[in-house]
């Protein structure tokens, strides 16, 4: 059985301050059954960005409908970027479990914040 | 409070065909996928269509598949299921459902009966 | 026919403890839930994703799972438990939801 993989195509996306970061993700497998989600950083302090099954989100929205049953592109778009968003985002498939388990994670997609053109 | 109210339900020969619509409340209709299921009078349940947020994607089991069509009309929160060339054995309650994140149903409507009999 | 296999009944005395089992379905490619329905009712949901109870449910209801058989639990049983309980399922190899036949939990 092939390894599920987790492609983060982009090693790198530069956005003006004020608009909006698209953060490309697909999996290469649905199975095993288990979530997506978005962190900034990696390690222990990393930050949770997203999540379909549960949390509230404002400026995070999916850029495929999380809902088709053959849905593989979990890729996010964050609007109204600031410098506070800069770091690495990594798109992490988990296993169900309880808690689910970390299965697979992407290289990461390094953003970074240009000041808005005057 | 989620709220899934079905109607059209009746009686009906067999050869024909109904509508039944499912009015949704209480959260935002347009972010969820749905599902219809039924119930044989003294029987078990029956997942017989599925549908996404968007209504681009629709899923059926093989017993009504090419008979029965899922729809959506995201504008008016309302949730369809057309039937056609029904038969005896399709005769049930119908409910509509609310799907969670990962394709389980957490909310039911009361159901609404389609009798099939000459 | 049913794709999942759970007992078509259970019988359990007030305060003892009730458990109904449901397999049938690969662990790897399936997400599991249980409903509760009372005559005359639509059905509840009492445990989803395997072993997650939603809100309102009473703690006395729990999921687990082991290898491709999944288990509902209620501990000290009470007589509006009294109920017919259906596992589902949702395959991700197959994009389906199947059901279990039910199975009638009888409180002594």
């Known amino acids: 059985e092939e390894e599920l993989q987790v492609i983060q195509p982009e090693k790198s996306v530069s956005v003006a301050a004020g608009d909006s970061a698209t953060l490309n993700c697909t999996v290469s497998s649905l199975i095993p059954v288990g979530p997506i989600q978005w962190f900034r950083g990696a390690g222990p302090g990393r930050e949770l960005i997203y999540n379909l099954k549960e949390g509230h989100f404002p400026r995070v929205t999916p850029v495929s409908d999380p809902t088709k049953r053959n849905n593989m592109d979990f890729s996010i778009r964050i609007s109204n970027i600031t410098p506070a968003d800069a770091g690495t985002y990594y798109c992490v498939k988990f296993r169900k479990g309880s808690p689910d388990v970390e299965l697979k994670s992407g290289a990461g997609t390094e953003l970074s914040v240009r000041a808005k053109p005057s | 409070e989620v709220q899934l109210v079905e109607s059209g339900g009746g009686v009906v020969q067999p050869g024909g065909s109904l509508r039944l619509s499912c009015a949704a409340s209480?959260?935002?209709?347009?972010?969820?996928?749905m599902s219809w299921v039924r119930q044989a009078p003294g029987k078990g349940l029956e997942w017989v269509a599925g549908?996404?947020?968007?209504?681009?994607?629709?899923y059926y089991p093989a017993s009504v598949k090419g008979r029965f069509t899922i729809s959506r009309d995201n504008s008016k929160n309302t949730l369809y299921l057309q039937m056609n060339s029904l038969r005896a054995e399709d005769t049930a309650v119908y409910y509509c459902?609310?799907?969670?994140?990962?394709?389980?149903?957490?909310?039911w409507g009361q159901g609404t009966l389609v009798t099939v009999s000459s | 026919s049913y794709e999942l296999t759970q007992p078509p009944s259970v019988s359990v005395s007030p305060g003892q403890t009730a458990r109904i089992t449901c397999s049938g379905g690969?662990?790897?490619?399936?997400?599991y839930a249980w409903y509760q329905q009372k005559p005359g009712q639509a059905p509840v949901l009492v445990i989803y994703?395997?072993?997650k109870r939603p809100s309102g449910i009473p703690e006395r209801f729990s999921g687990s799972s082991s290898g491709t058989t999944v288990t509902l639990t209620i501990s000290g049983v009470q007589a509006e438990d009294e109920a017919d309980y259906y596992c589902?399922?949702?395959?991700?190899?197959?994009?389906?939801?199947?059901f279990g036949g039910g199975t009638k939990l009888t409180v002594l």
């Open positions: 549908i996404s947020a968007g209504g681009s994607d629709t």
């Open positions: 994703s395997d072993d």
């Open positions: 690969a662990y790897s490619s399936y997400y």
């Open positions: 209480g959260f935002t209709f347009s972010s969820n996928a």
């Open positions: 459902a609310r799907e969670t994140w990962n394709h389980l149903f957490d909310y």
């Open positions: 589902g399922g949702y395959d991700q190899s197959s994009y389906t939801n199947p």
